[in-house]
């Protein structure tokens, strides 16, 4: 006999990266008929919602009107049908941004390169932080972590046209509190690739520095259970 229900899906709208003092909604999607949803923050009960009527609702929303560093951290949710509780959802890392200062992002040898050239991004911030994050904007947000006293370098290695795009970086004061974003840097990669082995469908990055794909609401795929299950936002752990 089943002792627990399938885990719900958790995500943040409009994004898991929330500028301080801005609003964010944490969404938890379980099953129709769930009479209670619980949101947990850093392992403790944070909020409860009891949908009405439960048989017509399979998703609840927990609204945070004013994001700050105390609200940043790891969230999960569970739901109950009758007396039976679900497994906990994957962890959602909610990050507060626009804290303190703005880093500077640059790219060497330049913003326009030939496919196959080595490219390195540099993120610099003169205030007290030692962790930096590089994000590529778009359908899926790649996040790479780097370390350094005032500057971190992010070597992409030989680039392909898949590396084209707009990049920003952040200084990280802790796992869930990030600086203002840098000004964007648009990387253009030109040149036809003769060696197709150099042109993966998506850029490849060092496994130890790149987190999982972080799907944002712009993908329109939040409701794809299998996909969200597979792409849980566990970057920062």
């Amino acid at each position: 006999q089943q002792q627990t229900l399938p885990k719900p899906f958790i995500w943040a709208e409009p994004h898991f990266m929330v500028p301080k003092e801005k609003q964010v909604t944490i969404c938890c999607q379980g099953n129709y008929g769930a009479v209670e949803y619980q949101l947990h923050f850093e392992g403790s009960l944070f909020a409860v919602d009891r949908p009405k009527p439960p048989e017509r609702i399979n998703k609840v929303q927990f609204y945070i009107p004013d994001m700050n560093s105390r609200m940043a951290g790891q969230y999960s949710c569970i739901y109950r049908v009758g007396e039976l509780w679900s497994e906990p959802s994957n962890l959602l890392d909610l990050v507060v941004t626009e804290m303190y200062d703005t880093p500077t992002l640059s790219v060497h040898p330049g913003p326009e390169v030939i496919s196959g050239e080595k490219v390195t991004f540099y993120c610099r911030l003169d205030t007290a932080t030692s962790m930096f994050l590089l994000l590529k904007e778009g359908r899926s947000s790649h996040v790479q972590r780097g370390y350094g006293k005032v500057q971190a370098e992010f070597p992409l290695g030989p680039v392909t046209t898949a590396h084209r795009g707009t990049y920003r970086c952040f200084g990280s004061y802790n796992n869930h509190a990030w600086s203002f974003p840098s000004e964007p840097v648009k990387l253009l990669v030109t040149g036809d690739i003769e060696n197709t082995s150099l042109a993966p469908e998506d850029p490849t990055f060092p496994a130890d520095t790149w987190g999982t794909y972080l799907l944002t609401t712009e993908t329109g795929l939040q409701k794809d259970h299998a996909l969200w299950d597979h792409t849980a936002q566990n970057l920062l752990r």
Partner: antibody, heavy 118, light 107 residues
Framework: EVQLQQSGAEVKKPGSSVKVSCKTS????????MHWVRQAPGKSLEWFGG????????SYNQKFKGRATLTVDKSSSTAYMELSSLRSEDTAVYYC???????????WGQGTTVTVSS | DIVLTQSPATLSLSPGERATLSCRAS??????LHWFQQKPHESPRLLIK???QSISGIPARFSGSGSGSDFTLTISSLEPEDFAVYYC?????????FGPGTKVDIK
């Protein structure tokens, strides 16, 4: 020691083609892109195009696209620049230059003089 | 294309004097601006990268400044071997372009 050794001077007729070589040594050829820059007599420098030996990817100055071809031979660590349909305005010194991924053109060949004259 | 304008076209100075060379870009190129020196019958030589960063082996009297669209190369005290043509180069986007050059000659 990094060295870029270019082929010798060429005298060509209008309408013909020229192929200049740039043999490299002292570094890993596939790690740096190779660019070509030309300089007409008494004039400034003009970027011709670049090629990544790693991928074969190229980028050309649109001014020369269609007439220019950049290639590499990885086995001999040599880069080539070919320019077709030559005209008198193509008379110049042609340089190969390595593009460092942390700066710009850090090493240059000695230059190859191409004279186009009927 | 990014057009680079250099001024003055010619700078006539004496050894020991300070030389200030200007380079202006037709649009903002952040700090993706490099400086080269070229002497007669020689290949260009990289002097300054990314507007202000020094190059190993280049004398400390050469320095660069600027960002966006206005850049300056300064030679603090001219040595006899510094009389040459100086080019700025756009490293921001293709086509990579060079300025027309500033000739520093002996007064």
């Amino acid at each position: 020691e990094v060295q870029l050794q270019q082929s010798g001077a060429e005298v060509k007729k209008p309408g013909s083609s020229v192929k200049v070589s740039c043999k490299t040594s002292g570094y890993t050829f596939t790690e740096y892109s190779m660019h070509w820059v030309r300089q007409a007599p008494g004039k400034s420098l003009e970027w011709f195009g670049g090629i990544s030996p790693n991928s074969g990817g190229t980028s050309y100055n649109q001014k020369f696209k269609g007439r220019a071809t950049l290639t590499v031979d990885k086995s001999s660590s040599t880069a080539y620049m070919e320019l077709s349909s030559l005209r008198s305005e193509d008379t110049a010194v042609y340089y190969c230059a390595r593009r460092d991924f942390h700066s710009s053109f850090d090493y240059w060949g000695q230059g190859t003089t191409v004279t186009v004259s009927s | 294309d990014i057009v680079l304008t250099q001024s003055p076209a010619t700078l006539s100075l004496s050894p020991g004097e300070r030389a200030t060379l200007s380079c202006r870009a037709s649009q903002s190129i952040s700090d993706y601006l490099h400086w080269f020196q070229q002497k007669p019958h020689e290949s260009p030589r990289l002097l300054i990268k990314y507007a202000s960063q020094s190059i190993s082996g280049i004398p400390a009297r050469f320095s660069g400044s600027g960002s966006g669209s206005d850049f300056t190369l300064t030679i603090s005290s001219l040595e006899p071997e510094d009389f040459a043509v100086y080019y700025c180069q756009n490293g921001h986007s293709f086509p990579l372009t060079f300025g027309p050059g500033t000739k520093v000659d002996i007064k």
